[in-house]
């Protein structure tokens, strides 16, 4: 049976004032707008889950990434930081600042034949590989080159938003991230409380489309906090 | 090329525990979720295992949780999976493979579980 | 759990033959969160379709996805030698993640 109680869920790309978050263990999620499936945290361990401020990229906000503020310092102790500029160093994608994809440990520039629903692919970019971005790319698109120049549809796994197409976000699935379809008018959203707060959301929903913003349900003013229900409602 | 190399299987008796790992090269590791699947012989595919591109988050088959223990080390670009009170209807071919929809595999490894 | 039931569960036909292989989903999965694998004798599954009509890298034209809510449907349009295989559906909208029985497409 479908679970009523609709508060789960999060994402990464939270344009201002929808950053934050909520989520708690053993309440349902969902990963189509509205639908949701009750119990899916059972299959959830959070052993290693640390309370710090965040413990993935996807948890911070467009321009940061999550990683530990000191060289060599506790691995357990990460928080959102700023993301590195093009021709600065890189471990992976979500280092670099929109727009930069990592290669060869350096932020560089990312033009759009880059980015596809199966990036890495394409992107053999592992550092301890001689391959480049380029090796891969010619290699590609003899092999597939429609597939190389779409943009991830709804259901292909992602680094960021900008490797979907249009209409699309890169949201958490499990312990993936997948194209989803930006909210529209009347769907349930995710209200985020406190940036950083949403490490034990299991699934992401995409933020509402343009021209709509995630508000308190009218007939929920009354409700509890924990039980007010947000939709996408235009501006 | 994306690669994904398993080994650690063998034979075993019940109760007792095996330690399989899964080498992966020509891909940023960190970057993607991992997943574990078996095979029983001459049966189909069952899901055992997930862990996001940090390793924070863990997920486990209702039939292995409490018993295996999914983690991946980012530094070596390997993905492990723990396995401890084994029962003979582990015995399967286990197969780390990338991301949710499973892109990559790797060739298997055989564990038998068996007195 | 959502269950993913294939049919038939052989299909026996010749190459240059179409083949059409179903999976039917116990739920409505209300996004395209469904793949294809494809399995050879003593090899690991291989990626065929995913977000249930998205061909993966190097996976030939003849073969296509379709279907949405609870059906879904493998077309290989014409059967090559090679494609003689067991073919599995996974949808990856919630836990567990799921596989159909298979279906084996073999020669006729």
């Known amino acids: 049976t479908l679970n009523s109680v609709l508060n789960s869920n999060a994402i990464k790309n939270l344009p201002p004032p929808l950053g934050g978050a909520a989520g708690h263990p053993g309440s349902a999620v969902s990963a189509a707008p509205g639908i949701l499936y009750p119990g899916g945290n059972k299959y959830q361990t959070i052993d290693n889950y640390q309370p710090y401020p965040c413990a993935e990229d996807e948890e911070c906000g467009t321009d940061e990434y999550c990683a530990s503020p000191t060289r060599g310092g506790d691995a357990g102790v990460q928080i959102c930081l700023a993301c590195r500029k093009r021709r600065k160093r890189c471990m992976r994608h979500a280092m670099c600042c929109p727009g930069n994809y990592c290669k060869n440990g350096i932020c560089v520039s990312s033009d759009q034949n880059h980015f596809r629903g199966e990036i890495e692919e394409t992107i053999t970019e592992s550092f301890g590989n001689d391959h480049s971005t380029l090796d891969g790319y010619s290699r590609r698109t003899t092999l597939s080159s429609k597939m190389y120049h779409t943009k991830g549809q709804e259901g292909s796994v992602c680094l960021r938003s900008s490797d979907c197409a249009s209409g699309l976000c890169c949201a958490r699935h499990f312990w993936s991230k997948i194209c989803k379809p930006v909210l529209k008018e009347g769907q349930v959203c995710t209200k985020h409380r406190r940036k950083g707060s949403h490490g034990l959301e299991i699934f992401q929903r995409c933020y509402c489309g343009e021209g709509l913003s995630c508000r308190i349900q009218k007939d929920h003013h009354q409700a509890s906090n924990s039980s007010r229900l947000h939709t996408c409602q235009r501006h | 090329q994306v690669q994904l190399v398993e080994s650690g299987g063998g034979l075993v008796q019940p109760g007792g525990s095996l330690r399989l790992s899964c080498a992966a090269s020509g891909f940023t590791f960190n970057n993607y979720g991992m997943t574990w699947v078996r095979q029983a012989p001459g049966k189909g595919l069952e899901w055992v295992s997930g862990?996001?591109?940090?390793?924070?988050?863990?997920y486990y088959a209702d039939s292995v949780k409490g018993r295996f223990t999914i983690s991946r080390d980012n530094s070596k670009n390997t993905l492990y999976l723990q396995m401890n009170s084994l029962r003979a209807e582990d015995t399967a071919v286990y197969y780390c493979a990338r991301t949710i929809y499973m892109d990559y595999w790797g060739q298997g490894t055989l564990v038998t579980v068996s007195s | 759990d959502i269950v993913l039931t294939q049919s038939p569960a052989t299909l026996s036909l010749s190459p240059g033959e179409r083949a059409t292989l179903s999976c039917r989903a116990s739920q409505n999965l209300f996004s395209p969160y469904l793949a294809w694998y494809q399995q050879k004798p003593g090899q690991a599954p291989r990626l065929l379709i995913y977000?249930?009509?998205n061909r993966a890298t190097g996976v030939p034209a003849r073969f296509s996805g379709s279907g949405s809510g609870t059906d879904f449907t493998l077309t290989i349009s014409s059967l090559e030698p090679e494609d003689f295989a067991v073919y599995y559906c996974q949808q990856y909208l919630t836990l567990p993640l799921t596989f159909g029985q298979g279906t084996k497409v073999e020669i006729k």
């Open positions: 862990i996001s591109g940090s390793g924070s988050y863990t």
């Open positions: 977000g249930a009509s």
